[in-house]
Interface confidence: low
């Protein structure tokens, strides 16, 4: 028995004085405290406990259930206690069969003794299966058996308590671990949406996943800058063992433009926290803003393509698009289509592929697109650009040479003569007249320019040449004539068309 | 390479309803929009409905608003049309196609014939008076 100084409170005294006794099952247990402040034997085995005030405890028939720690306690809180087994061949073992162990920790396969004096106290797999090589155990007569540093391997693991009892294996009844995961990692969190775009009175209904290895995660939606409660709901599920996935669902039912903003989906465990963010976005209409991806004035050479492309946003999603021209809707030569594969795209792209472009054209291209709520158009301005053609070359009554040319950019008209046999023109002379004839008509045509000279100031015979030129090329038209005595006999126009 | 199967056509008198289905293979389904088109004997191709990715948004000719209704399960990769009310107008041979153009997740549904790559061999219904 413990010894203390005098004068000092000193812990209660027990008879018989050892620290452990071994009766057989049937036998009497006789426990005396011995203590002026004696308070209470108890006792403890397993989950059990039971108390006693009187300072004598005894058991008459001793069953291998009072297998345990008996304590007696004085008033000064001080205490002394005795192990007694109650040995009974028939239960080897007392067994709480619940196995919980934390991952990296260890824990305890209750399976205390009734015996002491078995041997190869330790653990074995059911169905004569190997425990897992790096198990570690300690056993423990009067606790159990200690499993040393948990592994998530180790989960649903079936094992029996084992002894040798003369010279046979004994097991206790079975035991499966069950293994709650330590969290190694923050929680995985993801959300279905990362934007949305609604009309006001539409709901708002977002969700997010939250993933970790059990379902101890905390979860939360919160809104950023507020402290407001959202409404979530949860589904849950178990994918294998160490495997679970959650679903909050957050909702508006009827968003309004003040409910635009961001929302955190918020997660954490012991290891860390995680966040996921959506931004709600809440128009009071639908859109359609159109942007150019060209110039919208385009000028383009005579038989030229050139692809008129515009890029727009449109919420709702656009129902109707046409490309149109001198009210006439293009049927085909045109696509439209999503700017991006994101599910909240709102971006859309139309081509007009015009080919082989014409003289005549040129004109006002307008796109035109709608959705539910608005329409929105957008016009481009195409001029094409054509080498002069002379329309007319001849000799008015007045004696005046005329040339009419036509292109676009307007046509420069220059007048050169020739004398006698020369090739080359250079002499140039100038214009009695110069006028644009259709400027007042729509500005995408070609524009038609009339020059005149007066023949009357040509004395010698030769050759006049009529040029007409813009940016895209020239053409030219020429009058042959020759003089017979004082007259001019013969005026013969012709042209020579040059690239 | 994507395999378009239309069944369900048949003969049907006026007023009466017929449903047709299109199984489709070979691509992700579920991606892209899908869309059934008609061809009458002499006339061109026409649009008759479509649907989008998720069946979220749908797009029915001026011709069959409020008599027809696409649907589509991605789970069995089938698109189907109900069509009610029939009128001998409607008879034409119903061709199914795959908007491989379109983008998942946009809800974009087109009638353009030309955005639609893939094509089924299409199933005849007959509309008598």
């Known amino acids: 028995q413990p010894s203390v100084s005098p004068g000092e409170p000193s812990p209660p005294s027990i008879h018989p004085g050892k620290s452990d006794l071994i009766v057989r099952v049937g036998d009497e247990i006789r426990l005396l405290c011995t203590d002026p402040g004696f308070v209470k034997w108890t006792f403890e085995i397993l989950d059990e406990t039971n108390e006693n005030k009187q300072n004598e405890w005894i058991t008459e028939k001793a069953e291998a259930t009072n297998t345990g720690k008996y304590t007696c306690t004085n008033k000064h809180g001080l205490s002394n206690s005795i192990y007694v087994f109650v040995r009974d061949p028939a239960k080897l073992f007392l067994v709480d069969r619940s196995l919980y162990g934390k991952e990296d920790n260890d824990t305890l396969v209750r399976c205390p003794l009734t015996d002491p004096e078995v041997t190869n106290y330790s653990l074995k797999g059911c169905q004569g299966k190997p425990l897992p090589k790096d198990l570690r155990f300690i056993p423990d007569p009067k606790a159990g058996i200690m499993i040393k540093s948990v592994k998530r391997a180790y989960h649903r693991l079936c094992l029996h308590c084992s002894v040798d009892q003369e010279g046979k294996s004994v097991l206790s009844e079975k035991f499966i671990l069950k293994v709650r995961p330590a969290f190694k990692a923050v929680p995985v969190v993801s959300v279905s949406k990362a934007s949305y775009l609604l009309r006001e009175g539409e709901e708002f209904t977002v969700t997010c996943t939250i993933k970790d290895v059990s379902s101890s995660v905390y979860s939360t939606w919160k809104r950023e800058n507020s402290q407001t409660k959202l409404q979530e709901k949860y589904n849950s599920w178990h994918h294998g063992d160490f495997n679970y996935e959650r679903q909050a669902t957050l909702t508006i039912s009827s968003a309004r433009v003040n409910d635009s903003g961001v929302f955190m989906c918020y997660a954490n465990n012991t290891f860390g926290s995680a966040n996921v963010t959506t931004t709600l976005e809440v128009v009071d209409k639908g859109f359609i803003n159109i942007f150019p991806m060209i110039n919208t004035t385009v000028f383009v050479n005579d038989g030229e393509n050139v692809d008129l492309i515009v890029e727009y946003e449109a919420f709702p999603k656009p129902e109707h698009q046409q490309w149109i021209y001198m009210n006439r809707t293009f049927t085909d030569k045109w696509e439209d289509y999503p700017k991006s594969e994101n599910e909240s795209n709102i971006r859309y792209v139309s081509e007009l592929h015009l080919t082989r472009l014409k003289g005549t054209e040129g004109g006002t291209y307008t796109f035109l697109v709608s959705n539910s709520d608005v329409n929105a158009a957008i016009a481009f301005n195409v001029y094409v650009n054509t080498k002069p053609e002379i329309l007319t070359y001849d000799r008015l009554v007045n004696g005046m040479l005329q040339c009419v040319a036509a292109g676009f950019p307007e046509p420069t008209i220059d007048w050169y003569f020739c004398p006698g046999t020369e090739q080359r023109c250079s002499a140039s002379v100038l214009p009695v007249d110069v006028q644009t004839l259709n400027s007042s008509g729509p500005p995408f045509g070609k524009l038609v320019v009339q020059s005149s000279i007066d023949s009357s100031a040509f004395k010698h015979n030769g050759t006049v040449e009529c040029k007409a030129y813009n940016d895209v090329g020239k053409t030219s038209a020429y009058f042959n004539f020759a003089f017979k005595g004082n007259n001019k006999e013969q005026i013969h126009p012709h042209t020579l068309f040059t690239p | 390479q994507v395999h378009l199967v239309e069944s369900g056509g048949g003969l049907v008198q006026a007023g009466g309803s017929l449903g047709l289905s299109c199984a489709a293979s070979g691509h992700t389904f579920s991606n892209y929009a899908m869309g059934w088109f008609r061809q009458a004997p002499g006339k061109e191709r026409e649009f008759v409905a479509a649907i989008s990715w998720s069946g979220g948004s749908t797009l029915y000719a001026d011709s069959v608003k409020g008599r027809f209704t696409i649907s589509r399960d991605n789970g069995e990769n089938t698109v189907y049309l109900q069509m009610n009310s029939l009128k001998p107008e409607d008879t034409a041979v119903y061709y199914c196609?795959?908007?491989?153009?379109?983008?998942?997740?946009?809800?974009?549904?087109?009638?353009?014939?030309?955005?639609?790559?893939?094509w089924g061999q299409g199933t005849l219904v007959t509309v008598s008076s």
């Open positions: 196609a795959l908007d491989s153009t379109g983008v998942y997740g946009t809800g974009y549904v087109s009638s353009r014939k030309g955005r639609y790559e893939y």
